[in-house]
């Protein structure tokens, strides 16, 4: 669709005569008829296939034509067409004399024609005017013409329809050739796809308007590139949504079981060495001079009764010192100047001569030891208590004070963690070396089956058209991540293309 425009500029008829040679009385009141038709090698009469237009009387004899409306007519003259411009044309311009006000052909005398010109040729669509001048024996006509496209039509032939828009169906303006030029922030064949925030993750993010990044379920962050771990995940991470991959030193479904108590809590005191021995379980190896489960108690060096033969021990800053009884000497009073005659054996020990009476040895009754039977037996020296139990001397016997979770004479027995039925909702309890584990029935989870969980909403494959299904644990629902070209809560609808254009 377009318009052929003809601009009449000047008509010269100095003698004021008709084509027949007869003069006009009083002068030639001149109007024009224009016929636009398809290209003819020889322009001949016949239908004006591209259109016709007439002017009012524009002047008498010789006159210039103004560029605007003149007496109700328009200059340039408009010859609209509703087809593809063919690039060639034929044009007939007739100048007529109007004796009266009625300009209809049937109202004019047959010899009212002043002049007639006919041209033909090629004409491309464009903004530039082509100037022409046609001269006959008695008249001269100067004019210019061009073809331009109607609004919203573009291209070499005015055949491409393009109407700028900024709505749901597209966001674009039109280029001179009729191609779409997307508005900033939009892309796609019809400029319907927003360009998301720069860096927005292709799969995990999307946008409904330019420069935004909306996250699909299970993802977060400015660019939707950080997954959200399983709800309840404490010391874990994820690489896909709702995972819970435990950090080092943590275990369990929610990574909330401490497998590295030593590092996380540093329970051993006074430079002791800590060894992990299971969930929340550890053993401290004390440095010399310290004791207790956490090596929190300072030992006196005299506590080990280093002085023999009844020697008394004195603590010193750099160790200890033995004060020996009469008849004994040495660092620990271990050397004797006595014989059996001096009755050196205490606590009912019996004396035996050695080396022809130069020395002796004491045979001690039960519960006593030492070269002179002077020491009560410390039944805790062999560390008989297992699992970190504390050994206590009780007269002639000993006993073990056990840590929580252990029992038995030597703390060698685990207390059954399952005895108190810790698993909720009918969970099955299993005793483990370092604690317990619950096997939960369907619909429950958690360390003690205390969390009611939904059945996997994606199990029924609710998404169509190869969409990816995510279970949103926070709402017990599924969400479908649609591939390009599909919409709907289950990706069941293909995206409708916008109304088709004429090209």
């Amino acid at each position: 669709s377009g318009v052929f425009q003809l601009q009449l500029q000047e008509f010269i008829n100095e003698r004021g005569v008709l084509a027949s040679g007869r003069p006009c009385e009083p002068g030639c009141r001149t109007f024009f008829r224009v016929c636009l038709k398809h290209f003819q090698a020889v322009v001949s009469p016949g239908p004006c296939t591209f259109g016709t237009v007439s002017t009012p009387v524009l002047g008498t004899n010789s006159f210039a034509v103004r560029d605007d409306s003149s007496g109700g007519g328009r200059n340039p003259l408009q010859l609209p067409f509703n087809f593809t411009w063919p690039g060639t044309f034929s044009l007939i311009i007739e100048a007529w004399h109007a004796p009266g006000d009625d300009l209809r052909p049937e109202a004019l005398p047959p010899d009212a024609l002043i002049s007639k010109i006919a041209i033909q040729g090629s004409l491309a669509v464009g903004q530039n005017w082509l100037l022409d001048e046609q001269t006959s024996t008695l008249t001269r006509l100067r004019y210019s013409y061009r073809v331009i496209c109607s609004d919203n039509y573009y291209g070499d032939n005015c055949s491409r329809l393009c109407k700028k828009r900024n709505d749901h169906f597209g966001h674009y303006v039109c280029q001179p050739d009729g191609n779409l030029s997307c508005l900033p922030g939009w892309t796609g064949e019809y400029c319907q796809q927003p360009i998301c925030l720069s860096g927005c993750h292709e799969q995990n993010g999307y946008c409904s308007k330019p420069a935004e990044c909306l996250c699909r379920p299970g993802w977060q962050g400015r660019l939707c590139n950080e997954c959200i771990p399983h709800n309840g995940c404490r010391h874990g991470t994820c690489s896909t949504p709702w995972q819970c991959t435990c950090d080092e030193g943590w275990g369990g479904l929610f990574c909330d079981q401490d497998l590295n108590y030593c590092t996380h809590h540093s329970p051993c005191k006074n430079g002791a060495t800590c060894s992990n021995s299971g969930q929340r379980s550890y053993t401290c190896t004390c440095r010399p001079g310290y004791t207790g489960v956490d090596c929190e108690l300072e030992l006196s060096e005299c506590d080990s009764n280093p002085c023999r033969n009844g020697g008394s021990c004195k603590d010193q800053e750099d160790g200890y010192h033995c004060l020996c009884p009469p008849g004994y000497y040495g660092l620990h009073c271990e050397h004797s100047t006595l014989s059996c005659a001096d009755s050196p054996c205490f606590n009912g020990g019996s004396c035996r001569e050695r080396n022809q009476g130069a020395n002796y040895a004491c045979e001690c009754p039960p519960n006593f030891t030492g070269s002179n039977c002077e020491k009560k037996v410390d039944r805790c020296t062999s560390n008989p208590c297992a699992n970190g139990g504390q050994c206590l001397n009780r007269g002639p016997s000993r006993m073990c004070r056990c840590r929580p979770g252990f029992t038995g004479t030597y703390c060698e027995l685990h207390v059954s963690d399952c005895a108190r039925n810790p698993c909720a909702h009918g969970g099955t309890c299993h005793d483990l070396e370092n604690g317990l584990m619950c096997t939960c029935p369907a619909g429950f989870s958690g360390r003690r089956c205390e969390v009611r969980t939904s059945i996997d909403a994606c199990a029924s494959s609710p998404c169509f058209n190869r969409a990816t299904c995510y279970t949103d644990l926070s709402t017990d629902t599924f969400v479908c991540n649609c591939p390009y070209g599909f919409v709907g809560s289950r990706c069941e609808f293909p995206v409708g293309l916008p109304p088709s254009f004429p090209w």
Partner: nanobody
């Protein structure tokens, strides 16, 4: 049930300070990015600040940059907003929320919301 409960709002003079808190429950707080959003009377919601799940990355709207500080304590399931050098234009209801969509300047779509706490800056 997810709950976000804001507190710490009140009336303060221009130039004064307030510290807002948001206590979270019903979800694993430490796994989620968090945000503060405010809504002044007769206006739409305006993003104020955001912080990532670990607390290492913080974001601020231009209007509060240098005056407000966002922080979180994942052990206490609590989000904070320290507001200094307050101005009358900071008067609004302040909400904490979990962002699920970002624009060029900050979050603009949210999942969970609190009920809000009123902050009034007036002499």
């Amino acid at each position: 049930e997810v709950q976000l409960v804001e507190s710490g709002g009140g009336l303060v003079q221009p130039g004064g300070s307030l510290r807002l808190s948001c206590a979270a429950s019903g979800f694993t707080f430490g796994n989620y990015d968090m945000s503060w959003v405010r809504q002044a009377p007769g206006k739409g919601p305006e993003w104020v600040s955001a912080i990532n799940s670990g607390g290492g990355d913080t974001y601020y709207a231009d209007s509060v940059k240098g005056r407000f500080t966002i922080s979180r304590d994942n052990a206490k399931n609590t989000l904070y907003l320290q507001m200094n050098s307050l101005k009358p234009e900071d008067t609004a209801v302040y909400y904490c929320a979990t962002p699920r969509g970002w624009g060029p300047t900050g979050p603009h779509e949210y999942g969970y919301w609190g009920q809000g706490t009123q902050v009034t800056v007036s002499s």
